[in-house]
Interface confidence: medium
């Protein structure tokens, strides 16, 4: 299937990286810089040549809460996350590439700066390929490292 996503036409001011309000972190890492929208995240990923990490979650979901706790408290994850464009969402986007096997939460997906969804970077659960549990921090770290190895794209 085609896993290349199309960014919106939204423009962004170049080289402006103000510290965003902590509310955008929603508790996933207050010291990290989080983007506000999917379109903005795609734009930043493409222009900065950094992969995008998208976390879909819900505040009322206990699994989301549990994963958020270990994500925010794990120093390695927080450090590695600095190398990503970051987005956490409590709603679904219209991009079906971000829910290839369902709109469950929490799920974590990666998008290459070439705007290709990294469908190959999966968790360990067959029912929910992009789900992670609190015990999966080592796997998530490995997957983040995989995502940092950017896809080679032909010019």
């Amino acid at each position: 299937r085609d896993t290349t996503v199309k960014p919106g036409a939204k423009k962004d001011t170049k080289d402006s990286r103000p510290k965003l309000p902590q509310t955008l972190s929603r508790g996933w890492g207050d010291q990290l810089i989080w983007t506000q929208t999917y379109e903005e995240a795609l734009y930043k990923s493409k222009t900065s040549n950094k992969p995008l990490m998208i976390i879909h979650h819900l505040d009322e979901c206990p699994h989301s809460q549990a994963l958020k706790k270990v994500f925010a408290e794990n120093k390695e994850i927080q450090k590695l996350a600095e190398q990503f464009v970051l987005l956490n969402l409590v709603y679904e986007t219209t991009d079906k590439h971000l829910s290839p096997d369902g709109q469950y939460v929490p799920r974590i997906m990666f998008v290459d700066p070439s705007l290709t969804v990294r469908a190959d970077i999966t968790g360990r659960y067959s029912n929910r390929l992009y789900a992670y549990e609190p015990a999966d921090t080592a796997l998530l770290l490995d997957n983040m490292k995989k995502a940092l190895k950017l896809l080679k794209t032909e010019l």
Partner: antibody
Framework: QIQLVQSGPELKKPGETVKISCKAS????????MNWVKQAPGKGLKWMGW????????TYTEEFKGRFAFSLATSASTAYLQINNLRNEDTATYFC??????????WGQGTSVTVSS | DVVMTQTPLSLPVSLGDQASISCRSS???????????LHWFLQKPGQSPKLLIY???NRFSGVPDRFSGSGSGTDFTLKISRVEAEDLGVYFC?????????FGAGTKLELK
Amino acid sequence: QIQLVQSGPELKKPGETVKISCKASGYTFTNYGMNWVKQAPGKGLKWMGWINTDTGKPTYTEEFKGRFAFSLATSASTAYLQINNLRNEDTATYFCGRVTADSMDYWGQGTSVTVSS
Amino acid sequence: DVVMTQTPLSLPVSLGDQASISCRSSQSLVHSNGNIYLHWFLQKPGQSPKLLIYKVSNRFSGVPDRFSGSGSGTDFTLKISRVEAEDLGVYFCSQSTHVPLTFGAGTKLELK
């Protein structure tokens, strides 16, 4: 630790029904699908299909459509295989196996089903 | 269905020998997501199969490093660097790239 414990051996007559259980422990049951695999005496392994333990949706291979049914008791972290209208050729050991995104990592010990008149 | 052909069907060895088992698939096992879902299992008499190697070359937890897997596309190999008594049994390759999941017929590793 992760375990899949299956019910004991069964001796049945042709035409009868058997229901095998597979109780999971040591992990979140609804995060992993469950495979069912048949191994006839002296034969290889044959995948029968799987059940999505999250949605309860079963998927059967062509050979195992009709008389075979996968089901769940999610609250008891248990998967079931039921075989209706048993035939002699159903004599085999049946295994359940946990499905991960990568492979089938943990298997039950197997349940021997003997069909004989 | 994808046919998995294992060779040899029987492999007599002495303890300490290196053993090599081949598995060939009737079509490529490269998934559309780029992964290759080719796995190796060991089944000892009266027991259930145990996962040794998943996705061609990844050792499952607790599997000794004398076991290694390699291959690509349609040709895959399981190697045991120094056979120990506990390694005897039937080895199955399996693919889960395509539905239905299929297994090889098995290779019996036995003492000479």
